[in-house]
């Protein structure tokens, strides 16, 4: 902690300007009024203060606002934000998207720090839900943001926000996250026509149930193999050969190259070999002709 020392004569700061970079730490502590600093925070960013000097300025604000900074100060923190701890940020009440953007800008190009994560958490909790504008902003700064959220957190995303999501934002999402996001996406895009709908929903299909995949097969979507390989295995297994053929369209030939990988491998095992043979792709491993297929789920339901 910096000692309390009197400000030397003539050094009392009347405004926040570049002359302050020549002040020693103790002089900043003694000669800069915290209230002045708070009202002129927007100037701090333009002045090349050292990290040590920024520590002093932060200390002054902490003393002035022990319960947490007001948003008028937070919005102009600039590089001083990097000095904040998650504990500091938890005291804040950030409601303006402009404030959020300003602080994310400071951290741009870096991994999401604990400070940023805390800031986002405070902001989203304050808003009550992850609305479209917020999601737009967050995914612009952190494309993987959405996939960093738990399924529980994702459940607060309203369907309208899904319009802000780009395919790359979902690259690192796991099936549990897509299970939550897919129904929201289906709702968000439900009024679009077939081909436009597919373009939008495609990235979310890792959360699609069997029925929706069967329905997609009715829309001439010609799903590519990369998308097919990301589908839930349990959703793919009940699809018939004809449905997969219709779903993939001309891309059905790509099944051969993927026949040893899930979900194609597991799907092949569920099909009658003579049905697979009709594709003319040489897919092997289906149920031999003449074998009886028992529906175990039905058997369990009856017993």
């Amino acid at each position: 902690e910096v000692e309390k020392t009197a400000c030397p004569s003539g050094k009392k700061a009347r405004e926040i300007d570049e002359s302050l970079i020549f002040y020693k730490k103790w002089e900043l502590e003694a000669c800069v009024d915290a209230a002045l600093l708070a009202t002129q925070m927007d100037r701090v960013n333009a002045i090349p203060f050292t990290y040590e000097q920024l520590d002093v300025l932060k200390h002054k604000l902490d003393e002035l606002y022990p319960q947490g900074y007001p948003e008028s100060v937070i919005q102009h923190l600039g590089y001083l934000f990097l000095k904040m701890s998650p504990e500091d940020i938890r005291k804040w009440n950030v409601t303006s998207l402009e404030t959020l953007k300003a602080l994310l800008e400071v951290n741009k190009g870096h991994e999401m720090s604990p400070q940023v994560a805390t800031l986002i958490d405070r902001f989203v909790k304050g808003r009550g839900q992850l609305d479209k504008d917020t999601l737009d902003t967050l995914t612009a700064f952190y494309p993987g943001y959405l996939c960093s959220l738990s399924p529980e957190e994702l459940s607060s995303v309203p369907p309208s926000s899904i319009w802000a999501v780009r395919p790359q934002d979902l690259d690192t999402c796991d099936p549990r996250q897509l299970d939550v996001l897919y129904p929201k996406a289906r709702l968000a895009f439900q009024n679009m026509n077939g081909s436009e709908y597919f373009v939008k929903i495609q990235s979310f299909l890792g959360g699609a149930p069997t029925e929706d995949l069967k329905a997609l097969s009715q829309q001439n979507v010609s799903m590519d193999l990369a998308t097919f390989m990301k589908l839930r295995t349990d959703a793919v297994l009940p699809l018939t050969v004809a449905e997969v053929q219709k779903l993939l369209g001309p891309h059905v030939e790509g099944l051969k190259a993927e026949e040893r990988h899930r979900p194609v491998r597991d799907w092949i095992l569920r099909q009658r070999q003579d049905d697979l043979d009709t594709l003319g792709l040489g897919l092997q491993g289906g149920i031999p002709n003449g074998y009886l297929v028992l529906d175990l789920s039905m058997q369990e339901a009856l017993s």
Epitope: P209, E211, K214, A215, Q218, N220, T240, A242, Q245, K246
Partner: antibody, heavy 117, light 107 residues
Framework: EVQLVESGGGLVQPGGSLRLSCAAS????????MSWVRQAPGKGLEWVAT????????YYPDSVKGRFTISRDNSKNTLYLQMNSLRAEDTAVYYC??????????WGQGTLVTVSS | DIQMTQSPSSLSASVGDRVTITCRAS??????LNWYQQKPGKAPKLLIY???RLHSGVPSRFSGSGSGTDFTLTISSLQPEDFATYYC?????????FGQGTKVEIK
């Protein structure tokens, strides 16, 4: 062996309603889309409606849209067609058919619906 | 909607004859073309799907060919049980549509 048995056909006045049923057996009903296809006397085949395996999605041609409603009860392995505002041109044999991707692969024996005053 | 046009509307043939029925789609339907056989007072039965693939239990004298808009059903050697009406159906695009039928009669 796949079996589809339609019922509920009969004589109805123009503007009237009728509900057809189709009892399915020999396959896992809840795994398949199902359809209704009709055939007017001495005429060709016309697709009437299709429903997804879970009942979420339904499809109709313009000729019956808004008048006919396809539904299903997977617990009873039964398909339905509710026909309202019936017209003389709806007179036909109505077939229930299993729908696989793009193929009507198994058909029932049909039930005759006659719309006449 | 895609229109399906079959020709001829009817034909007379003898047992053992080679019979060819054509079906034309008003726009490209890839290979999503199916053929059905219907006998009087009976339900239609699937014969061929995806242009050329025989449904289970269908005799090998039936064959199909074509692509895009023009398709053919061929019966290599007509048998007594083959006298019936044949329908083509496109499964490419909703609404799914059928041809008007071709009646194969005994000469």
């Amino acid at each position: 062996e796949v079996q589809l048995v339609e019922s509920g056909g009969g004589l109805v006045q123009p503007g009237g309603s009728l509900r057809l049923s189709c009892a399915a057996s020999g396959f896992t009903f809840s795994d398949y889309f199902m359809s209704w296809v009709r055939q007017a006397p001495g005429k060709g085949l016309e697709w009437v409606a299709t429903i997804s395996n879970g009942g979420t999605y339904t499809y109709y041609p313009d000729s019956v849209k808004g008048r006919f409603t396809i539904s299903r009860d997977n617990s009873k392995n039964t398909l339905y067609l509710q026909m309202n505002s019936l017209r003389a041109e709806d007179t036909a044999v109505y077939y229930c058919a299993r729908f696989d991707g793009y193929i009507f692969d198994y058909w029932g024996q049909g039930t005759l619906v006659t719309v006449s005053s | 909607d895609i229109q399906m046009t079959q020709s001829p509307s009817s034909l007379s043939a003898s047992v053992g004859d080679r019979v060819t029925i054509t079906c034309r789609a008003s726009q490209d339907i890839s290979n999503y073309l199916n053929w059905y056989q219907q006998k009087p007072g009976k339900a239609p039965k699937l014969l061929i799907y995806y242009t050329s693939r025989l449904h289970s239990g269908v005799p090998s004298r039936f064959s199909g060919s074509g692509s895009g808009t023009d398709f053919t059903l061929t019966i290599s050697s007509l048998q007594p049980e083959d006298f019936a009406t044949y329908y083509c159906q496109q499964g490419n695009t909703l609404p799914y549509t059928f041809g008007q039928g071709t009646k194969v009669e005994i000469k």
